[in-house]
Interface confidence: medium
């Protein structure tokens, strides 16, 4: 597979208004969440921190695509963002709203 | 989407001979690795332990499939297996060869 199509982090800007979360998130209006896109073909690159299961699954898929699906390119490390949100009608500050932005992708 | 096609653990038997690992794994000849198959459509079920990022990505995909890919059904918990393997020509027993079999799937 062309290297450019391999599993990697790509931009994905989330507009809270677009997903209806502006009803409870006051600020920011949106954020850069990123997403993981691309394929996980065998051999799986080291920087994609594949599990043994992912390596085996990718190898089985390579030999027989009917038997197993490809390993999947997913977030392996997420970071928090800071938000102002509504809690019982009061604006509340959450310094670390966990699991919102991708910092690393990998093959699983 | 039909419930039957939703993200879940499905059988995947690994034959070590088939993937060429019989050259160093003496026993067992193979094992039940399982794999995670199916879709992660919004709303993501609680038992699939979705991250906030996965929920948001699934929601964006629902509203605009061009903007974001679906969240992916992947192993979220792996278990070890026991193996007999060759280490510098010596047969060695490994009680816990980690990350080999899927015990839980989720949307990421």
């Amino acid at each position: 597979n062309a290297k450019g199509n391999y599993c990697k982090r790509t931009p994905l800007y989330i507009d809270f208004k677009e997903i209806g979360w502006d009803s409870w998130i006051i600020a920011p209006p949106g954020y850069e969440a990123y997403e993981c896109r691309g394929v996980c073909n065998y051999p799986l690159a080291e920087h994609l921190t594949p599990t043994k299961h992912a390596i085996i699954q990718a190898l089985v898929h390579l030999k027989n695509s009917q038997k197993a699906s490809k390993a999947c390119c997913v977030p392996t490390k997420l970071e928090p963002i800071s938000i102002l949100y509504l809690d019982k009608g009061v604006v509340t500050y959450k310094f670390k709203y966990e699991g919102m932005a991708v910092s690393e992708c990998g093959c699983r | 989407n039909a419930k039957g096609n939703y993200c879940k653990r499905t059988p995947l038997y690994i034959d070590f001979k088939e993937i060429g690992w019989d050259s160093w794994i003496i026993a067992p000849p193979g094992y039940e690795a399982y794999e995670c198959r199916g879709v992660c459509n919004y709303p993501l079920a609680e038992h699939l332990t979705p991250t906030k990022h996965a929920i948001i990505q699934a929601l964006v995909h629902l509203k605009n499939s061009q903007k974001a890919s679906k969240a992916c059904c992947v192993p979220t918990k792996l278990e070890p297996i026991s193996i007999l393997y060759l280490d510098k020509g010596v047969v060695t027993y490994k009680f816990k060869y980690e990350g080999m079999a899927v015990s839980e799937c989720g949307c990421r």
């Epitope: 006051i26 920011p28 102002l84 009608g89 604006v91 509340t92 500050y93 | -």
Partner: antibody, heavy 115, light 111 residues
Framework: QVQLKETGPDLVQPTQTLDITCTVS????????VHWVRQPPGKGLEWMGT???????DYNSAFKSRLAISRDTSKSEVFLKMDSLQTDDTAKYFC?????????WGQGIMVTVSS | QFALIQSDSMSTSAGSTVKLSCKRS????????VYWYQQHEGRSPTTMIY?????PDGVPDRFSGSIDSSSNSASLTINDVQVEDEAIYFC??????????FGGGTKLTVL
């Protein structure tokens, strides 16, 4: 009823430290947030920082490391401490309650920085 | 960091309609909520509009907030202007990192 009252000095010498207390009543500091806002004579409002209900603090970077905000929830007091005052820090200093929006303000305290 | 730009002063006559503007220097005005405050001479400010177009209890419906994307501005419209509306009006929004930004204020004179 809800009240906020700022207390502190009217006059501060240049290079000295400003200490203002905002005493609140009618609500809990663990439920509502408190802003500090100042207004130089004849000028606009300037946000200084916020004491969040959860205990977190946010500062306006314009004040760099000169500013410290703290609180004593048992006494329903929020404190503003600013070091190295200069004449252009002469202003009326307000504390204000932030619920869904800023719904209550103190009457403000006029602080003059002069020798 | 952006600035919120307001004209220094405006004059209007009682009974008329006036529109106060708050222009965002960079970035999209619609991307963060806008708040409007009224401050009478020598008094503390009060919130007139929050979340761009909502009025707190007690604020007359003569006051309304809106966003104009084409001019990248927020507006506070006062219908049927009263003498007691003479005050300074400040807009406020959020910058990235959840910092509170105020406009410089517009002094409204009612003739």
């Amino acid at each position: 009823q809800v009240q906020l009252k700022e207390t502190g000095p009217d006059l501060v010498q240049p290079t000295q430290t400003l200490d203002i207390t905002c005493t609140v009543s009618g609500f809990s500091l663990t439920t509502y947030n408190v802003h500090w806002v100042r207004q130089p004579p004849g000028k606009g409002l300037e946000w200084m920082g916020t004491m969040w209900n959860g205990g977190g603090i946010d500062y306006n970077s314009a004040f760099k490391s000169r500013l410290a905000i703290s609180r004593d929830t048992s006494k329903s007091e929020v404190f503003l401490k600013m070091d190295s005052l200069q004449t252009d820090d002469t202003a009326k200093y307000f504390c204000a309650r932030l619920g869904y929006y800023v719904d209550y303000w103190g009457q403000g305290i006029m602080v003059t920085v002069s020798s | 960091q952006f600035a919120l730009i307001q004209s220094d002063s405006m004059s209007t006559s009682a009974g008329s309609t006036v529109k106060l503007s708050c222009k965002r220097s960079t970035g999209n005005i619609g991307s963060s909520y806008v708040y409007w405050y009224q401050q009478h001479e020598g008094r503390s400010p009060t919130t007139m509009i929050y979340d761009g177009d909502k009025r707190p209890d007690g604020v007359p419906d003569r006051f309304s907030g809106s966003i104009d994307s084409s001019s990248n501005s927020a507006s506070l419209t006062i219908n049927d202007v009263q003498v007691e509306d003479e005050a300074i009006y400040f807009c406020q929004s959020f910058s990235s990192g959840i910092k509170f930004i105020f406009g410089g204020g517009t002094k409204l004179t009612v003739l």
